[in-house]
């Protein structure tokens, strides 16, 4: 069967469906969680919802085969399988790999190091969020975009404050944290 990938944010309502139309006049349709845990089965004009962690928060649309899941959580991460038993006795299968991610929290910017080096100001900042697999991007007056949780830069003497923004993102959300630096090698945060 075909495999489709889906990434959604935790707490949202999700529709698992296939991009093609169902076989005509199919006999039975089943949705599985992790290949062997039946969630729901349709046949003879009725849907049967089985005892599972999804009971009460799933609904099947027999027309399209779509499975609606409300309030998905990270524990719902899995490969979901839709199996259709056709009128001719053949089975067809579709797989959807669902990844549920929490929205990223607002990052905290920590000053790891700040010191005068030959009249310049050496600055080392880290962008911290608790145990998440995320992407980091620093923005500000930088020679190039930095995609790392740590920013290291050396500033020449200047009169104005400079701000650096760390953006943390995963495939479902992003949040920013900003650090503003004023000479002489001292800081204020916003």
């Amino acid at each position: 069967g075909r495999l489709v990938h889906m990434t959604v944010v935790s707490g949202s309502n999700v529709t698992l469906n296939i991009s093609e139309s169902l076989p005509e006049n199919y006999k039975q349709l089943t949705w599985f969680y992790t290949f062997d845990q039946k969630i729901v089965e349709w046949d003879s004009g009725k849907s049967k919802y089985f005892e599972s962690k999804f009971k009460g928060r799933v609904r099947l649309d027999p027309q399209s085969g779509a499975l609606y899941i409300s309030k998905v959580q990270k524990e719902d991460n899995s490969t979901y399988v839709m199996r259709v038993l056709k009128k001719d006795g053949y089975e067809q299968e579709w797989k959807i790999k669902l990844q549920v991610l929490d929205p990223v929290p607002k990052p905290v910017i920590k000053i790891e190091k700040r010191e005068d080096v030959d009249d310049n100001c050496y600055l080392k900042l880290s962008c911290v969020i608790p145990g998440e697999s995320v992407n980091y991007t620093w923005y500000g007056e930088l020679p190039k975009e930095i995609q790392n949780s740590v920013l290291e830069t050396t500033l020449k003497p200047h009169k104005h404050s400079r701000c650096y923004t760390c953006q943390v993102s995963n495939s479902v959300s992003s949040k920013n944290g900003t650090f503003c630096f004023s000479p002489p090698c001292t800081a204020a945060r916003s």
Partner: antibody, heavy 121, light 107 residues
Amino acid sequence: QVQLVQSGAEVKKPGAAVKVSCKASGYTFTAYGISWVRQAPGQGLEWMGWISAYDGDTNNAQKFQGRVTMTTDTSSSTAYMELRSLGSDDTAVYYCARDRYSSSSGYFDYWGQGTLVTVSS
Amino acid sequence: DIQMTQSPSSVSASVGDRVTITCRASQDISSWLAWSQQKPGKAPKALIYAASSLQSGVPSRFSGSGSGTDFTLTISSLQPEDFATYYCQQANSFPYTFGQGTKLEIK
């Protein structure tokens, strides 16, 4: 892993009844149907009937109509097959088999180990 | 009732051989056919359903084909553990019926 464990061998007198059990484990019992199949000594396989563990719906082979009763107990994940008015030609090994669907598709994916029922006076 | 007829009723073959068993239905059953394997004193084991779909865990040397009334089970390269009796079964309509079995013996 999926297992269907059947009750032990039985010896019955002609005219008596026998009740064979099939205890399921390793899956959600109500999500699949159970068929009963028997095999007389040295003979082939004969389908007796099917029951939905979801709602108790049944379909029996005409040959056994009125003589067989299939039931399930969802609290213990057990299917039962009772055969009445036993005759010597009912001597056979009785198997339960899990259907791939909760309604009958006729495709069996797991079988119990079998229960030998001997009918003898 | 739909009659299922298997041929041959027994066949002798050697390890490594390719073996084909055929099954004929008395009426069109589309692809509603299953194959099972049974060893002496043991329960049947599901091999193939929907005429050609392999049950989970069944070695790929087993394959099924056909539709309508004529079906075949092929074992591409016989292994010692394949010597057993094979049954076809129609799942098209109640009552489900089985073929009489084909006994595969060591030559």
